[in-house]
């Protein structure tokens, strides 16, 4: 069965730039990546990039580059600006539309005592839905 | 259809606060962005902020300086805008509209506002 | 803030001329570009979006282009009910509008 999977890492250099990197695992094409936070997009989460793979990428702020790193992986960079958004202890979803087999979503976080430049491991949380 | 329906024109005082409504019909209210844009006559457009229905998340043009608040009512798919502190620079057509992966794609009617003695 | 400055305020046109309608942001916004239509009395109308893609149900004769800081808006064989404002928007960081070009008959 189709998986995707969710790393979210601080960047070094910046302690205030955060990535989250999505990928899907499984056969077919990917015909749109949404990536939200605080939760699942639709279920008290707040959309924050749209990717299309013909039609480009929309996002919302925080978010400040949302791009694709191979034909079924996505980033995502984030400006964290403070206090008004705590990505530290924020969840972010990565939600994959597949033809055909629908769609996959799951969320991750930073692990609560990461180091700058080290990110999730690449696996799955349980929430994990297939539409 | 996508429709975006806005309240009737407000004639209001300085001082005090408007609010204006704007009710979404024909998609998912939860899922788009609502923006809120101001045009004074003759003039170009200034985005005030949008809020997130599904979250009730917002972001403002910080040369409001905190007098707009958004906000939403998921039961009956409506956003308001509510702009206090009003002065005759207020005074301009206030527009709502959808924010989706094409940009601002159905807007209301628009809906103004003139402040006045 | 990112400005985006359309220089020309306004334009004279004839019916069946070729309009370009510049747009340039003061950094690069890639190209998440968008031009709208405003008549008098109406609300914006999306034409282009991501700099060069027609929205649903706009003719062809407009076209978007450009990409990084400098954009155009071109309406070929120009018709009379195109003239109207014109204006930008960059949805890159936050939302910015250019001042927008009004087209009108010479």
């Known amino acids: 069965t189709p998986e995707v999977w969710v790393q979210v890492q601080m960047e070094a250099t910046e302690l205030s730039s955060f990535t989250v990197h999505c990928g899907f695992l499984g056969p077919g094409s990917i015909s749109l990546v949404t990536v939200s936070w605080g939760g699942p997009d639709g279920a008290g989460g707040t959309k924050l990039a749209v990717l299309h793979p013909e039609l480009g990428t929309r996002q919302w702020a925080p978010a400040r580059q949302a791009r694709w790193e191979t034909q079924s992986s996505i980033s995502l960079a984030l400006e964290d600006s403070g206090a008004s958004s705590p990505f530290a202890n924020t969840t972010f979803c990565c939600k994959f539309a597949s033809f055909p087999e629908g769609s996959w979503e799951s969320c991750g976080s930073l692990p609560p005592s990461s180091d700058p430049g080290l990110s999730a491991p690449p696996t799955p949380v349980p929430i994990l839905r297939a539409d | 259809q996508i429709q975006l329906q806005q309240s009737g024109p407000e004639l209001v005082k300085p001082g005090p606060s408007v609010k204006i409504s704007c009710k979404a019909s024909?998609?998912?209210?939860?899922?788009?962005?609502i923006n809120w844009v101001k045009q004074r006559p003759g003039q170009g457009l200034e985005w005030i902020g949008w809020?997130?229905?599904?979250?009730?998340?917002?972001k403002y043009n910080e040369k409001l300086k905190g007098r707009a608040t958004l906000t939403v009512d998921t039961s009956s798919s409506t956003a308001y805008m509510q702009l206090s502190s009003l002065t005759s620079e207020d005074s301009a057509v206030y527009f709502c509209?959808?924010?989706?992966?094409?940009?601002?794609?159905?807007w209301g009617q628009g809906t103004s506002v003139t402040v006045s003695s | 803030d990112i400005v985006m400055t359309q220089s020309q305020k306004f334009m004279s046109t004839t019916v069946g001329d070729r309009v370009s309608i510049t747009c340039k942001a003061s950094?690069?916004?890639?190209?998440?570009v968008a031009w709208y239509q405003q008549k008098p009395g109406q609300s914006p109308k999306l034409l282009i979006y991501?700099?060069?893609n027609r929205y649903t149900g706009v003719p062809d004769r407009f076209t978007g282009s450009g990409s990084g800081t400098d954009f155009t808006l071109t309406i070929t064989n120009m018709q009379s009910e195109d003239l109207a404002d014109y204006f930008c928007?960059?949805?890159?960081?936050?939302?910015?509008f250019g001042a927008g070009t009004k087209l009108e008959l010479k």
């Open positions: 509209a959808r924010d989706s992966f094409y940009a601002m794609d159905y």
């Open positions: 024909g998609y998912t209210f939860t899922d788009y962005y």
């Open positions: 809020i997130y229905p599904g979250s009730g998340y917002t």
């Open positions: 950094q690069n916004v890639g190209t998440a």
């Open positions: 991501s700099a060069s």
């Open positions: 928007l960059q949805y890159s960081s936050y939302l910015t």
